[in-house]
C-alpha cells in the first residue's frame, strides 16, 4: 500500500458520568479509551479485507463527562435510567460529521445482556455506519448514524477488558458493514466437531464471548466479505491518511510531549493545550518535569512522584504498581504466581492476568453443564470442568466426580459470565439468560424510524 492511502478512521469518543464514576479520574478514563482503541486498531490492522489492508483507528477528539456533569442540562447522557436504544439515539442526535465514527462509553447495566449497539453500514442506499453524515429523518430530527455505544457492565458485574475490547470491535464491525455471523462456516463455536468448537466464535458472533478463544478476536470470512464491500465504497468519504498525531485528543502519541486536550478541557499546569500555537501545543511548559497526561506518576505540580508512591491498585493477579521516581508512566506490576485463584475463585491467574478457568488448576478444562434435554438448566451457571477434550466427563464443580478438588463446593459463575455454550449470560440469580441478539432492533422497529432504516441497527 502507498503512504497516501486513506486507511485511518478517526474517532470521537465520549464517556458518560457513570463511566467516569467507575474509573475515578480523567487519566484512568483516557487510559481506558486508549486501550480500547489500541485493541481494535490491532484487530483491524491485522485483517486483510479482501485486499484492503492496514485499516487503523485514531482518536480525533474525546469528551469526558465527569460526575460534575451529571446535572448539566447540556449533557445528553446525564439521565440515570435509559435503555440501550435511547442511549444510542442520544449519541446519534449530535452532529458527528467531522468523524468517521462517534462512540459513547458507559458503565450501565442494559437489559438482556446487551453490551453494545451500533448502526450497520452498507455499501449503498443505507443510512448508518462509517462516514455517514447528519441528516433529517422521518421523526423530524437530524441524526448522525455513524455511531455506536458500548458498556462495561453486564448483569451487575464488570466485564473483563478483553471482552470489552471485543465488544468495541464487534460494534465497530457493524458500522463497517458486518451483520452478525451465521451459518456453520462462520459460527464454529456452535459446531458439534470438538476440534472446530474449541477455537470458539468470531468477533461478530451474535451472543456471548469469553474473549480467550483463538477466533474470538478475529473476523470470520462472512464479516470480511461484508466489510470489504463497505470499505470499497465508503472509505474515501471520510478516512484519512495515517500519520500525524492529533494534539488535543488527550492521548500522548508519538511526536507529542504531553496532551491535556483543548483549552476548554485542559486542567493541567504542565502542558500547553491544543489551542496554543504550532510550536508550543502538546509540549511541556518550560521547567516542568512531566504532565499528568503522560501517566499517573506525575504530580499536579508537574514533578515525578517519589519512588514509593502507588500508581496502580493490587489486583487478583498482579501486585500494586509503584512509581520509580524517574518517569510519569506506572511501571508494570509484578504478577502473582500462576494458578492463584481469581475472579472469586472461578478463574486462575496466568502470567499476571485472570485468564484461565479454575478447572485448569487441576489439569481439567472448563465446559458448559448443559443437557440436550434441558433437564440440568440449574447447572448452567455452575463452573463445570471436564477432562481435556472429553465432553462426556463434563460435570459441575459441586459434583462428586470433582469432589477431590472442590470438596463438593459448587463454584458458580460470576454474573455476566457467558453460559450455555455462549448462548447467554448468567444473571445475579444464577440463571442463564439467553441473549436475544436482535431485541433492541425489534424494539426500534416500533419506534420512530422509517421502515428503510429497520435493518441498519444491531447489537
Amino acid at each position: 500500500t502507498t503512504s497516501a492511502e486513506k486507511n485511518t478512521c478517526q474517532l470521537y469518543i465520549q464517556t458518560d458520568h457513570l463511566f467516569f464514576k467507575y474509573y475515578g479520574t480523567r487519566e484512568a478514563v483516557i487510559a481506558q479509551i486508549s486501550s480500547h482503541v489500541k485493541a481494535i486498531d490491532t484487530i483491524y490492522q491485522t485483517t486483510d479485507f479482501s485486499g484492503i489492508r492496514n485499516i487503523s483507528f485514531m482518536v480525533k477528539r474525546i469528551r469526558i463527562n465527569t460526575t460534575a456533569d451529571e446535572k448539566d442540562p447540556t449533557n445528553p447522557f446525564r439521565f440515570p435510567n435509559i435503555g440501550v436504544e435511547k442511549f444510542l439515539e442520544l449519541n446519534s442526535e449530535q452532529n458527528h460529521d467531522d468523524y468517521c465514527l462517534a462512540y459513547v462509553f458507559t458503565d450501565r447495566d442494559f437489559d438482556d445482556g446487551v453490551l453494545g449497539l451500533a448502526w450497520v453500514g452498507a455499501p449503498s442506499g443505507s443510512s448508518g455506519g462509517i462516514c455517514e453524515k447528519s441528516k433529517l429523518y422521518s421523526d423530524g430530527k437530524k441524526k448522525s448514524l455513524n455511531t455506536g455505544i458500548i458498556t462495561v457492565q453486564n448483569y451487575g458485574s464488570h466485564v473483563p477488558p478483553k471482552v470489552s475490547h471485543i465488544t468495541f470491535a464487534h460494534e465497530v464491525g457493524h458500522n463497517f458493514g458486518s451483520p452478525h455471523d451465521s451459518g456453520t462456516e462462520c459460527t464454529p463455536g456452535e459446531s458439534k466437531n470438538l476440534g472446530q468448537k474449541e477455537n470458539g466464535n468470531y468477533i461478530m458472533y451474535a451472543r456471548a464471548t469469553s474473549g480467550d478463544k483463538l477466533n474470538n478476536n478475529k473476523f470470520s470470512l462472512c464479516s470480511i466479505r461484508n466489510i470489504s464491500q463497505v470499505l470499497e465504497k465508503k472509505r474515501n468519504n471520510c478516512f484519512v491518511e495515517s500519520g500525524q498525531p492529533i494534539c488535543g485528543n488527550g492521548m500522548v502519541e508519538q511526536g507529542e510531549e504531553c496532551d491535556c486536550g483543548y483549552s476548554d478541557q485542559c486542567k493541567d499546569e504542565c502542558c500547553f493545550d491544543a489551542n496554543q500555537p504550532e510550536g508550543r501545543k502538546c509540549k511541556l511548559k518550560p521547567g516542568k518535569q512531566c504532565s499528568p497526561s503522560q501517566g499517573p506518576c506525575c504530580t499536579a505540580q508537574c514533578a515525578f512522584k517519589s519512588k514509593s508512591e502507588k500508581c496502580r491498585d493490587d489486583s487478583d493477579c498482579a501486585r500494586e504498581g509503584i512509581c520509580n521516581g524517574f518517569t510519569a508512566l506506572c511501571p508494570a506490576s509484578d504478577p502473582k504466581p500462576n494458578f492463584t485463584d481469581c475472579n472469586r475463585h472461578t478463574q486462575v491467574c496466568i502470567n499476571g492476568q485472570c485468564a484461565g478457568s479454575i478447572c485448569e488448576k487441576y489439569g481439567l478444562e472448563e465446559c458448559t453443564c448443559a443437557s440436550s434435554d434441558g433437564k440440568d438448566d440449574k447447572e448452567l451457571c455452575h463452573v463445570c470442568c471436564m477432562k481435556k477434550m472429553d465432553p462426556s466427563t463434563c460435570a459441575s464443580t459441586g459434583s462428586v466426580q470433582w469432589s477431590r478438588h472442590f470438596s463438593g463446593r459448587t463454584i458458580t459463575l460470576q454474573p455476566g459470565s457467558p453460559c450455555n455454550d455462549f448462548r447467554g449470560y448468567c444473571d445475579v440469580f444464577m440463571r442463564c439468560r439467553l441473549v436475544d441478539a436482535d431485541g433492541p432492533l425489534a424494539r426500534l422497529k416500533k419506534a420512530i424510524f422509517s421502515p428503510e432504516l429497520y435493518e441498519n441497527i444491531a447489537e
Epitope: 487441576y362 489439569g363 481439567l364 477432562k387 472429553d390 462426556s392 466427563t393 460435570a395 459434583s399 462428586v400 466426580q401 470433582w402 469432589s403 477431590r404 478438588h405
Partner: nanobody
Framework: EVQLVESGGGLVQAGGSLRLSCAAS????????IGWFRQAPGKEREGVSC????????YYADSVKGRFTISSDNAKNTVYLQMNSLKPEDTAVYYC????????????????WGQGTQVTVSS
C-alpha cells in the same frame, strides 16, 4: 505402564461374603482414586464404590450401602471391596478402575481399567 489386576471373584450363596482385591502398579498410588464397577449381562456398567487414596474418602451406590466396604492398603498398592449379605442381583463381572483427576461412580471419568473378575451369587 498402568496396570490394574482384580482377583477374589467366585461363586457364592445368597447371604454370603466375598472380598475382591485390585492390585495397582505403574503409577503413584496416592495421587489416584480407585473405583469398583460392575456389569451384569445385557446391562450397562454401573458404579459400586470408590475411594480417594490420599484422604481415604469413600463413596457408595445406594444399592450396596451398608453391605459393601471399600478400603485400601497403601503399602501394597491394593484396594479391597468387602462384599457382605450378597444377593443374586449382585451377580456381574466386577472391574476396578483408576483415575488421577476424578472420583465418583460414573465410568466415563475413569481412565484406567482392569480386566474384571466374575462374581456369581446363587439363590
Amino acid at each position: 505402564e498402568v496396570q490394574l489386576v482384580e482377583s477374589g471373584g467366585g461363586l457364592v450363596q445368597a447371604g454370603g461374603s466375598l472380598r475382591l482385591s485390585c492390585a495397582a502398579s505403574g503409577f503413584t498410588f496416592g495421587d489416584y482414586a480407585i473405583g469398583w464397577f460392575r456389569q451384569a449381562p445385557g446391562k450397562e456398567r454401573e458404579g459400586v464404590s470408590c475411594i480417594s487414596i490420599s484422604d481415604s474418602s469413600t463413596y457408595y451406590a445406594d444399592s450396596v450401602k451398608g453391605r459393601f466396604t471399600i478400603s485400601s492398603d497403601n503399602a501394597k498398592n491394593t484396594v479391597y471391596l468387602q462384599m457382605n449379605s450378597l444377593k443374586p442381583e449382585d451377580t456381574a463381572v466386577y472391574y476396578c478402575a483408576a483415575d488421577r483427576l476424578a472420583y465418583g461412580l460414573d465410568p466415563n471419568f475413569y481412565d484406567y481399567w482392569g480386566q474384571g473378575t466374575q462374581v456369581t451369587v446363587s439363590s
